[in-house]
């Protein structure tokens, strides 16, 4: 006990009343108003509690403190009086703060600040929206991915800050009258091929595709090593030359020199060089056949093989090269008599006649082009008188029916010996290489040396055998008529043709056989 009559054991936040009692300090309370034992405590009274009599007034908040409380203006408000705290509603001078005025950059870019009571909001500019994680920050709306599909399907959507554009896809262009960019843009495919906007190499043909184009090798060309076909950067080389090489097993310097020239012409070949290249090949062939050199020392069968190889290859090469010529009629002739007539046209519906010194060919233009082939139509005729040397004593193989008919008509008159070549050997070709069964026949008129009386005149074609050689044949060809120095032949296929005089002694006017190619 304190001698002065004050208890020393009073709990924290209390004061003694006398020597045996204590009372809680203002702002604190205990279970009973007078504390008589040290076990009791004084607890802080929360003046801000709901049932409290304290009222701070509007736009303010009550803050409880140890043994007391403070009134403060709510966030977004400030006291006009300048006093940070107050005790009751009568002292309250809180009013709204205009944050937008205080800090003009509050909404950063792309937003407008709007003051509200006690706060502010950011109103985003068109094309922007509030960021969910930071509601005061305006972020670009990506109209292209927002599922709004604002652009026409012929365009692609390009998002930009605060906006978007509808742009024509690569390889497309605005339809007439349409803009390129606004959301009402409508586009159409650009035909790069016909508009000349393509980058195709001259060795290729341009094909338009939706929104793009591709470059395909020209007919008779193949992609250069390691370069795929049908790409924008496809570059091709002519197959024409690579396949025309000396026949296997034939050893001739003269022939090798000819094929060396062909390969030289092919090495740096370009479509624009077609005319010069055709002339140079025929010049080389003309010289080869004028002076066959060691070819003449080869066995007959090998000579026939060489002739077969030359005829076959020449037809392929001329077909390939002539597709690169411009429209019109070409005639070339060479010192030893080789002659070429060529007509190149975009397909026309009429018959075509090619005239040469010793032969005339007539056929329908519509035979010339394979359907779906984009190139021009070509009809060509080559007369190769020099080929006769290599085809001397070449056999004639008749179809069994014709053979039988001849035996019946001229029994016992079939003589030994090969047929005699009366005319120049001619070779006919079209841009279409599928000429085994023409829908309308081709007619040839041959001028030739005189026919020995009572000998059989046959229109024949050179049939390339399986062995790479060949023989004269008459299948699909018929002789329309023959005079002393001319014969008309009609054929349902194309190849190399000639008029032969066969060793049959014709007893009377014979309706049988005469064939052409």
């Amino acid at each position: 006990q304190d001698s002065r009559g004050c208890a020393r054991w009073c709990p924290q936040d209390s004061s003694c009343v006398n020597a045996t009692a204590c009372r809680c300090n203002p702002g604190f309370s205990s279970f009973s108003e007078i504390i008589t034992t040290p076990m009791e405590t004084c607890d802080d009274i929360n003046e801000c509690a709901t049932l409290s009599k304290v009222s701070c007034g509007k736009f303010s908040d009550c803050w409880n403190t140890e043994g007391s409380y403070d009134c403060v203006c709510s966030p977004g408000y400030e006291p006009v009086s300048g006093a940070k705290t107050f005790k009751n509603e009568s002292e309250n001078t809180c009013q709204d703060v205009d944050e937008c005025q205080q800090n003009p950059r509050l909404c950063k870019s792309y937003g407008t600040c709007v003051n509200t009571l006690g706060s502010y909001t950011c109103q985003c500019l068109p094309g922007f929206k509030l960021k969910p994680e930071d509601p005061k920050l305006c972020t670009d709306v990506n109209e292209c991915t927002s599922g709004q599909n604002p652009c026409h399907s012929s365009t692609h959507c390009l998002n930009n800050v605060g906006s978007y554009q509808c742009r024509c896809r690569p390889g497309w262009q605005p339809i007439p009258g349409s803009p390129n960019g606004p959301n009402n843009t409508v586009c159409e495919d650009v035909d790069e091929c016909s508009s000349g906007q393509h980058q195709c190499d001259s060795s290729t043909v341009c094909f338009n595709t939706v929104g793009s184009y591709s470059c395909r090798c020209r007919p008779g060309w193949k992609p250069r090593h390691g370069i795929p076909n049908n790409q924008k950067d496809t570059v091709c080389e002519d197959m024409t030359f690579s396949t025309w090489t000396p026949p296997p097993g034939v050893h001739s310097q003269t022939l090798s020199r000819f094929f060396d020239k062909v390969q030289d012409l092919g090495r740096d070949y370009k479509p624009g060089l077609a005319n010069n290249t055709i002339q140079s090949i025929l010049q080389a062939l003309d010289e080869l056949l004028e002076a066959p050199g060691d070819l003449e020392t080869l066995p007959r069968l090998q000579q026939h093989c060489v002739a077969s190889h030359l005829l076959d290859g020449l037809e392929d090469v001329l077909r390939g090269l002539s597709k690169n010529l411009s429209n019109g009629l070409l005639n070339f002739s060479y010192p030893a008599g080789t002659e070429l007539s060529l007509e190149v046209q975009k397909q026309v519906d009429r018959s075509v006649t090619l005239r040469q010194n010793q032969a005339v060919m007539q056929l329908d233009w519509n035979q010339a082009q394979k359907s779906g082939d984009p190139g021009p139509s070509v009809v060509g005729l080559v007369s190769i008188p020099g080929m006769g040397k290599l085809l001397a004593e070449a056999p004639l193989v008749l179809e069994p029916e014709k053979q039988m008919l001849l035996h019946e008509t001229h029994q016992g008159l079939l003589q030994d010996g090969s047929p005699i070549l009366l005319s120049d050997v001619i070779s006919a070709f079209l841009s279409n290489n599928d000429t085994q069964n023409l829908s309308s026949p081709v007619t040839f008129t041959f001028s030739h040396r005189s026919v020995i009386p009572r000998q059989k005149v046959l229109c024949v074609f050179w049939e390339h055998g399986q062995n790479g050689c060949g023989h004269w044949a008459t299948t699909g060809c018929s002789t329309i008529g023959t005079r002393d120095t001319s014969t008309i032949c009609r054929c349902t296929h194309l190849s190399s043709f000639a008029v032969l005089m066969a060793h049959y002694d014709v007893q009377e006017e014979d309706p049988v056989l005469t064939v052409i190619t």
Partner: antibody
């Protein structure tokens, strides 16, 4: 008639570049390769390369790769040769000539003299 | 590359004399061409494809050969024939010229 008209003489400093032109007339520009030939004073003919005007394809001799750039403009039927990093040994007469494998070089320009001097 | 060796390098001939020069190739060549060049002028194509005379070339000139061996002949030398003659091939890249044969009038 076929003509190849070359640009006038050039005087250039070492390290500089010159672009020579060769204007073709009288024939279809894309039917032949355009050849470029160098001839130093008192020396023989030296092939530089060729350009095919139809597609801009070029052929070069190894020595002139990187030294001579060959181009052709179909619209004006003109072939060009740019010679770069000029040195004294580039002083020469440069000819353009129309060429085809089987015919050789049948028409020649009059030549352009290039002198490299500091 | 194909090297063309011309011989002789220099030769002289009197008017009326027959002149022959050769061009030897290090590999086989199928198209050989010859050019004439006079001092201060552009070369002129003289013979092409081994033996064909270019337009305007007198027929006293001729060419022959095959493979690796080619020759150029003037049947009867004339004063106007004095010039340098070059052979040329393009059978393989790069195109090459011979070093030339200088023909002088004796």
């Amino acid at each position: 008639q076929v003509q190849l008209q070359q640009s006038g003489a050039e005087l250039a400093r070492p390290g500089a570049s010159v672009k020579l032109s060769c204007k073709a007339s009288g024939y279809t520009f894309t039917n032949y390769w355009m050849q470029w030939i160098k001839q130093r004073p008192g020396q023989g003919l030296e092939w530089i390369g060729a350009v095919y005007p139809g597609d801009g394809d070029t052929r070069h001799t190894q020595k002139f790769k990187g030294k001579a750039t060959l181009t052709a403009d179909k619209s004006s039927s003109t072939a060009y040769m740019q010679v770069s990093s000029l040195a004294s040994e580039d002083s020469a007469v440069y000819y353009c000539a129309r060429g085809f494998t089987a015919y050789g070089m049948d028409y020649w320009g009059q030549g352009t003299s290039v002198t490299v001097s500091s | 590359q194909i090297v063309l060796t011309q011989s002789p390098a220099v030769m002289s001939a009197s008017p009326g004399e027959k002149v022959t020069m050769t061009c030897s190739a290090s590999s086989s060549v199928s198209y050989m061409h010859w050019y004439q060049q006079k001092s201060g002028t552009s070369p002129k194509r003289w013979i092409y494809d081994t033996s064909k005379l270019a337009s305007g070339v007198p027929n006293r000139f001729s060419g022959s050969g095959s493979g690796t061996s080619y020759s150029f002949t003037i049947r009867s030398m004339e004063a106007e024939d004095a010039a340098t003659y070059y052979c040329q091939q393009w059978s393989s890249n790069p195109l090459t010229f011979g070093a030339g044969t200088k023909l002088e009038l004796k």
